[in-house]
């Protein structure tokens, strides 16, 4: 939010030199008027009258929804996740029909033992959440299951999850190579068939703050951009202060139009200001520039 600039006159001049008589209204903004009942409201840009005031659509605000906000709320998820569809073959358990029934005691016991085994296998992966058996079938026991991974959202979340999926692959390959039957017996919690380990599919949460920002900015999409602060994305226009992309209007007010951000320069009793950034001051009485 911008601080109001104390001025002694009310005229604002655009950087091109024309005087703007109604500074709060962007004359280049398309105007649509909403009429509800017999209340003719000046709700522009798709806004509607709720009986008391204009309810504005993003990215507009103001009494008549005539102004464009400087920042748009974008809310990335707190956590992001990945799901890996894996198949392993357990050789230390013989398949029985009861294992087909997910509500049977046999299935529950197998699920518990398998989960314990996988928790041991993936214990060093901070992103690891757990496993979920989707299907058991003959051979000895072919276990189709999902490995679930989760991490806090950061701009680098995809890299973190990609790295975690690689470690999962390495660890499951290692355990299914090492924990194998010897003389028809298994000394481990579970033994595996080395050749039965397959990664079928990997699904990673898709979240793109730039895309969300552009969508919400609508016709201003080319002028809103994403900047990060404390690993959190902000969808801002150049009129939002405090960011790398912020436009410095010096002696003026930043205003969004459909052609982008521009500075509306102020005129005081003693000076008028001009230039693209309102940084050229001319003293009214002496007519010389202060740079």
């Amino acid at each position: 939010p911008l601080a109001t600039i104390p001025v002694s006159t009310t005229s604002l001049t655009s950087s091109e030199g024309s005087t703007i008589s109604t500074p709060s209204v962007d004359i280049s903004t398309p105007v649509t008027t909403s009429i509800v009942g017999d209340q003719c409201s000046r709700c522009k840009n798709g806004g509607f009258w709720d009986g008391l005031k204009c309810q504005c659509l993003t990215p507009y605000y103001g009494e008549s929804c005539e102004e464009v906000v400087n920042s748009i709320d974008i809310a990335p998820p707190e956590t992001v996740s990945a799901q890996m569809e894996l198949t392993v073959t357990v050789t230390s358990v013989k398949f029985t029909d009861e294992l087909k029934n997910h509500s049977s005691q046999e299935f529950r016991e197998f699920n518990k033992t398998f989960t314990e085994q996988m928790n041991i296998v993936y214990s060093g992966i901070p992103e690891y959440v757990g496993v979920n058996i989707t299907n058991l079938r003959l051979g000895s026991v072919v276990v189709e299951h999902d490995v679930l991974l989760r991490t806090k959202y950061t701009p680098e979340y995809k890299t973190a999850l990609d790295n975690a999926t690689e470690v999962v692959k390495q660890k499951i390959t290692k355990v299914t190579t090492e924990q194998i039957m010897t003389n028809d017996n298994c000394s481990a919690l579970m033994c595996f068939n080395t050749t039965g380990t397959q990664v079928q599919n990997i699904t990673v949460t898709q979240y793109d703050p730039v895309e969300e920002c552009r969508q919400k900015a609508e016709e201003y999409e080319d002028y809103f951009l994403v900047e990060y602060r404390d690993q959190k994305p902000y969808c801002i226009s150049p009129c939002e202060s405090g960011f790398n992309a912020s436009k410095n209007c010096n002696h003026g007010k930043c205003q969004m139009s459909q052609n982008g951000a521009r500075c509306l320069c102020v005129t005081t009793e003693t000076h008028w200001y001009s230039g693209e950034d309102c940084n050229q001051g001319t003293q009214k009485s002496h007519h010389h520039h202060h740079h």
Partner: nanobody
Framework: EVQLVESGGGLVQPGGSLRLSCAAS????????MAWFRQAPGKEREGVAF???????SYAESVKGRFTISRDNAKNSLYLQMNSLRAEDTAVYYC?????????????????WGQGTMVTVSS
């Protein structure tokens, strides 16, 4: 609720015999796997033998030819016949069970356990 109760332990001289029994209640003895484990003082629990629902058996190398595991499905019972006992067979013997057809003597794979019966082989 599955309950396993062992009996038959005691003091026996080296070279002697003992028969351990395990009565299983709440466990469908015609299914899954039943096993005997033992734990000697100051040592880890080790698998002695297991038997599957179809009668398939497996033994630890140290007891092969001396011990015999069997189960009576009609009586819901598991047995361990121990012959030619040695001092190193001294331990608490545990009965364990799983509803799954297991081929492992890893104790963590068995969810159901008895309280154990003490076997002492000493002259």
């Amino acid at each position: 609720e599955v309950q396993l109760v062992e009996s038959g332990g005691g003091l026996v001289q080296p070279g002697g015999s003992l028969r351990l029994s395990c009565a299983a209640s709440g466990f469908p003895s015609s299914r899954g796997t039943m096993a005997w484990f033992r734990q000697a003082p100051g040592k880890e629990r080790e698998g002695v033998a297991f038997i599957n629902s179809d009668g398939r058996t497996s033994y630890a190398e140290s007891v092969k030819g001396r011990f015999t595991i069997s189960r009576d499905n009609a009586k819901n019972s598991l047995y361990l016949q121990m012959n030619s006992l040695r001092a190193e067979d001294t331990a608490v013997y545990y009965c364990a069970a799983s509803l799954l057809y297991l081929m492992t003597v890893n104790a963590a794979a068995y969810p159901y356990w008895g309280q154990g019966t003490m076997v002492t082989v000493s002259s």
